[in-house]
């Protein structure tokens, strides 16, 4: 019986037998017109599966069924009979082993093994014809017909819909004749279906519906191509803007041709001077998988300007799954001198096409939404950078993203574009041969954008040292070297082995720059992370400091300070993480503006009060400065005569 | 820049929300059975059964005739009256369980849940392109039906499938009924039987061949007959039933039962398990 794998669907819901058309017959390895039993199966009486589709359809050729049954009879009744082979049907008759009759010990001479009911010992296995594509649909009615050489399953569903689908096993999608709702009640379609002439009768609730075997109509086909590709028996034709049967639109109905259909194009704008490679999307362009366009059949105009058809780049041809459809057409747009700036239409006209399998392409499709624009360059920065290149140039202007090609040239060499938008282009400069000022220009669509700009190549920056070798988010780092201002910005980056974070240094001196560490989160507040800290200027060689310790930032206390006891001469306060960064940043503790020689004991800071310090009535402010950032933590006070501490 | 057209899904070329209005008929109750007839003189009909009523529709789905099939015991029941003066059994609604055409006559046969599941035979009378039903014949002969042996008790209230086959000059009804202990005890319908319609339509010939679920299994082993059909030399029934008499009765599978359409006997009754799978 064949396949044993897969998910079983043991419960038959509905069935119908019918002779099959040529195509399905071939797939089932039987002759056309042979009778096949079709069954809709579910996983259980409730019909709801765990995984997989709700309903599956299996096909059992009757001749094969009969053969299997006959072979089963032979196994039971012809010697040698396999020992232990049961006659079965124990619910109808007394249990017995083959070849014995039911309930009898052995055959008597005048009884025949074949003259008693039998359950054939092997089953007939089949897999879902629809390959799971019925998905959530719960089929409740089935009737199969042969139309031309096509076999169609007419199915009613639990939610009151009719699905008319070609029965074919080789596809990965369903070929629908129709899929429509019988009415608004949404009641299940009942099991029994009857045929009357060219119609099927389905019952749902208290209603009987008469459904044409060739489908209820053609209006559900939205495109001309899909309409004229419909099965011949459906009688679909194109009526200018809809698919219909001849009786619905006798005047305009035709099955001969389809106009091309533009659905989209790219880009939506192009330069008034210079060319644009225009890609048109849609259907019914040329009906040839290779994309070959016969000479002189396709004419594209954008506004007043012609667009010259381009041969399809075979390297770009994508395998299109038959379930998706789109056609691409490319042409080169060179605006005429008379073309005006502003919005216009894209028009595709196809004529003199040889007929395709289903129809020929003929007609015009117009789509609005293309604009001719004039790019303007307003500003460029920076206008200098290291000879090594890699400087990130920002070009600002208007309509900079129009068309399909643009190039920034620095001394004739392309500046690699990193980002393109309507008002801004970003690119990385190429290396320069010498320290010099060179011309910079922008081309859009091969035509130069007006404006005269120069770029200055400078000596490459050299980083000699980075200090200190530890820090935390936003703490200062000093970079020493030469020509450090040749780059628009030095970039500081920390790499922990997995990821990198960066910050930019503000331009200062050619030999020294002060930078801040980038944003980096140290997960463990008690620990730190070691990694590489690097500094580089644009494309010039950088400098890397290995074993850089990235620490959690220190947290100043939020509480006011406890007042000093009469005998105390030092102030103690907690400052989490401050001791850990003492080697990395400058720390200064002052009381009343006077510095104290502080010590760290874990997260405690001990600050001996300077002998010269006079604590007045209001006490003295305690200030801690870390890496140049100062916080007043509170005031140091002695208790008053009444014993109440005086502090703020 | 390598811009490519976005893929249009195949489904975008169709709209399955488009409303289609197809001809329909409102039966006035849940449709229980339906069968169509096409004559060779361009006449046709649709027969639609609901509780206690049988509608005859023309090819345009307009009502041509309506016949009261119940409730049994009601003076308005037109089919009941064909069996002569009653009572014929307990009163109650008639749910149509069988609605088939006897191709040999041609005639419509309807069997209901009332009156021991007896059947009625309605001659088809063409009137233009439509068809009318003649007064029904009651396929029941009281004198040869007993609770333990009832050739004229055809329909089971739990469901019955019938396929009519012409053999020689006789019409044979291949009948498959779902049973339980209660149904089996009342006028003994059989699981599978082959019944010959008597030439005079007074019922079915006694001594018909049959198979029935054994009494000891009736409680736990129920067979649902899903479909029946005749093709070539055989009549086939499709069933959903427990996979085993001894194991869990909720573990179901599907079987095909095959009976000879040329010999009205059950010695060559065969069953085959049908296995349908989804292989992702």
């Amino acid at each position: 019986g064949a396949p044993e794998g897969g998910q079983p669907y043991p419960v038959l819901r509905v069935a119908h037998s019918a002779p099959v058309g040529a195509q399905l017959a071939t797939e089932l390895s039987i002759a056309e017109g042979q009778e096949v039993l079709f069954g809709v199966f579910v996983t259980g009486k409730d019909g709801g599966p765990g995984v997989g589709p709700n309903s599956v359809v299996c096909a059992f050729p009757i001749d094969l069924l009969d053969t299997l049954i006959d072979e089963g009879v032979e196994r039971c009744c012809e010697s040698p009979v396999h020992p232990g082979l049961r006659r079965g049907l124990d619910f109808f008759q007394s249990p017995s082993f083959c070849p014995n009759p039911p309930g009898l010990e052995a055959l008597s001479p005048n009884t025949s093994c074949r003259h008693f009911p039998l359950l054939v010992s092997s089953s007939f296995s089949r897999v879902d014809l629809f390959n799971g594509l019925l998905g959530p649909v719960q089929v409740t009615a089935l009737y199969v017909t042969r139309l031309d050489n096509v076999t169609v399953a007419h199915m009613g569903t639990m939610d009151g819909r009719i699905l008319q689908v070609e029965l074919v096993r080789s596809l990965n999608y369903l070929l629908y004749v129709s899929n429509f709702s019988l009415g608004d009640s949404g009641q299940p379609v009942q099991r029994d279906v009857s045929r009357l002439g060219d119609h099927l009768l389905f019952a749902s609730g208290d209603q009987v519906f008469q459904v044409p075997i060739q489908g209820p109509g053609c209006r559900h086909f939205l495109t001309c191509g899909r309409c004229l590709r419909a099965w011949h028996f459906m009688g679909c034709g194109w009526c200018g803007n809809m698919c219909g049967q001849q009786k619905e639109c006798p005047g305009s109905w035709q099955q001969d041709h389809c106009p091309p259909k533009l659905t989209e194009f790219h880009p939506h704008s192009g330069p008034l001077r210079g060319s644009t490679r225009l890609t048109l999307c849609g259907s019914n362009f040329y009906l040839h998988p290779s994309g070959l366009v016969p000479e002189g059949t396709h004419q594209v105009t954008v506004g007043q300007s012609p667009c010259r058809p381009l041969p399809k780049d075979s390297s770009k041809l994508r395998p299109v799954p038959r379930k998706d459809f789109v056609e691409e057409f490319e042409c080169e747009l060179e605006p005429l001198g008379t073309q005006a700036v502003g919005p216009t239409n894209v028009s595709l006209t196809v004529t003199n096409m040889p007929p395709g399998k289903h129809f020929r392409v003929d007609g015009t499709s117009v789509l609005r939404g293309f604009s001719f624009m004039e790019p303007v360059l307003i500003a460029v920065q920076p206008l200098f950078g290291p000879r090594a290149g890699g400087t990130c140039l920002t070009l600002e202007g208007q309509s900079l993203s129009v068309g399909t090609s643009r190039a920034v040239l620095v001394n004739g060499t392309e500046c690699l574009l990193a980002r393109v938008s309507e008002g801004q282009l970003l690119c990385a400069t190429p290396p320069g041969a010498t320290v010099a000022s060179v011309p910079l220009s922008l081309q859009v669509g091969g035509a130069q954008v007006p404006g005269s700009w120069t770029f200055q190549y400078r000596e490459d920056p050299v980083v000699l040292s980075i200090s200190p070798n530890c820090g935390y988010i936003n703490s200062h780092i000093t970079i020493c070297g030469q020509h450090l201002t040749s780059a628009w910005h030095l970039v500081l980056s920390f790499h922990d082995g997995l990821r990198a974070v960066e910050s930019r240094c503000e331009r200062q001196l050619p030999e020294q720059q002060l930078c801040r560490l980038p944003e980096y989160v140290v997960r463990d507040p008690q620990g730190w992370v070691a990694g590489n800290l690097s500094a580089r200027g644009d494309g010039a060689a950088g400098f890397t400091l290995p074993g850089f310790r990235f620490l959690p930032p220190p947290h100043p206390p939020s509480a006011n300070l406890v007042p000093l006891k009469p005998e105390e001469h030092a102030i103690k306060f907690e400052y989490i993480g401050l001791g850990a960064v003492a080697d990395c940043v400058g720390i200064n503790v002052t009381v009343g503006g006077e510095s104290c020689q502080h010590e760290f004991r874990g997260d405690m800071v001990v600050c001996p009060l300077p002998p010269s310090l006079q604590l007045g009535q209001d006490g003295a402010p305690l200030q801690v400065c870390v890496d140049g950032e100062c916080h007043i933590l509170g005031r140091v006070v002695r208790p008053g005569p009444d014993g109440v501490p005086q502090s703020t | 820049e390598d811009w490519q057209c976005p893929r249009t899904p195949y489904a975008a070329s169709r709209d399955f929300d488009v409303k289609y209005v197809v001809p329909s008929f409102s039966a006035g109750g849940l449709v229980q059975a339906m069968v169509t007839y096409e004559g060779d003189r361009n006449e046709s009909a649709v027969f639609v059964a609901i509780r206690n009523r049988l509608h005859v529709l023309g090819p345009d789905l307009k009502s041509v005739q309506s016949l009261a099939t119940g409730p049994a015991g009601d003076p308005g029941c037109q089919t009941c009256a064909a069996c002569g003066p009653g009572p014929h059994g307990p009163p109650g609604d008639t749910d149509t369980k069988v609605l088939v055409l006897d191709p040999a006559l041609p005639a419509l046969v309807s069997c209901g849940s009332s009156l021991q599941g007896r059947c009625f035979l309605h001659d088809l009378e063409p009137q233009g392109t439509a068809v009318h039903l003649a007064a029904p014949a009651c396929l029941f002969s009281a004198h040869h039906n007993r609770p333990d042996d009832c050739p004229d008790c055809v329909a089971s209230p739990l469901g019955t499938r019938v396929t009519v086959v012409e053999q020689g000059q006789a019409s044979y009804f291949y009948v498959a009924s779902s049973l339980d202990a209660a149904v089996a005890a009342s006028f003994s319908p059989r699981s599978v039987s082959i019944r010959r319609l008597k030439a005079d339509a007074s019922g079915f010939a006694p001594g018909f061949v049959a198979l029935s679920v054994l009494p000891k299994h009736l409680v736990s082993y129920s067979i649902e007959y899903v479909h029946s059909f005749h093709t070539g030399a055989f009549v086939y029934f499709l069933t959903v039933q427990p996979a085993s008499v001894t194991d869990d009765p909720s573990a179901l599978h599907t079987r095909l039962a095959r009976l000879s359409a040329t010999e009205p006997e059950l010695g060559d009754y065969r069953e085959l398990v049908l296995d349908c799978r989804f292989a992702p």
């Epitope: - | 002969s141 020689g168 005079d200 007074s202 010939a205 006694p206």
Partner: antibody, heavy 121, light 107 residues
Amino acid sequence: EVQLQESGPELVKPGTSVRISCKASGYTFTSYYMHWVKQRPGQGLEWIGYIYPGNVNTKYNEKFKGKATLTADKSSSTAYMQLSSLTSEDSAVYFCARLGYYRYGGAMDYWGQGTAVTVSS
Amino acid sequence: DIVLTQTPAILSVSPGERVSFSCRASQSIGTSIHWYQQRTNGSPRLLIKYASESISGIPSRFSGSGSGTDFTLRINSVESEDLADYYCQQSDSWPTTFGGGTKLEIK
């Protein structure tokens, strides 16, 4: 009152055909089956076939297929039987008979007077 | 085809006597048997249907019985007008068939 009036006697030559009629009155012609029965001189009754005027459905005894053709005319409430390729074996009295309460092949409650057909050269 | 055998071929009785006609079927036919009377040069006339059901207008002296394969028509007091041929007919199976008939003679 139910009556079946058959056409008069026929003397015909071998190899020819004859059509005999049976006009019904006193009941609804289309609601009852009409049977035809043959009786050879001095012999028993032999069923030929029936026609149901309601739908012009017919059934024949295998022995008479090709020999007898049954038709009915609703407008005149008349049933007809045509006998073809006549031989001396076809010489007999032919009766039309209406079926009673049960249909198809039950008891025949009303009979025509019979039409004698003689086949002779 | 079902064969109906009527015995005897001829019955000779005196008026007022009780007479029985026998009809035997080649297979069981339930009660689907009907009896006809045919007088000389006349048409058959239905006497009994379904083995035992009487027909309106038929004298009550005619009765029938039997089921399965053996059937009997009785005239409980023969009258001279009963001189005729008597035929049984089965309507169980196609083709419907008639017995060969029994001739009733009056002594």
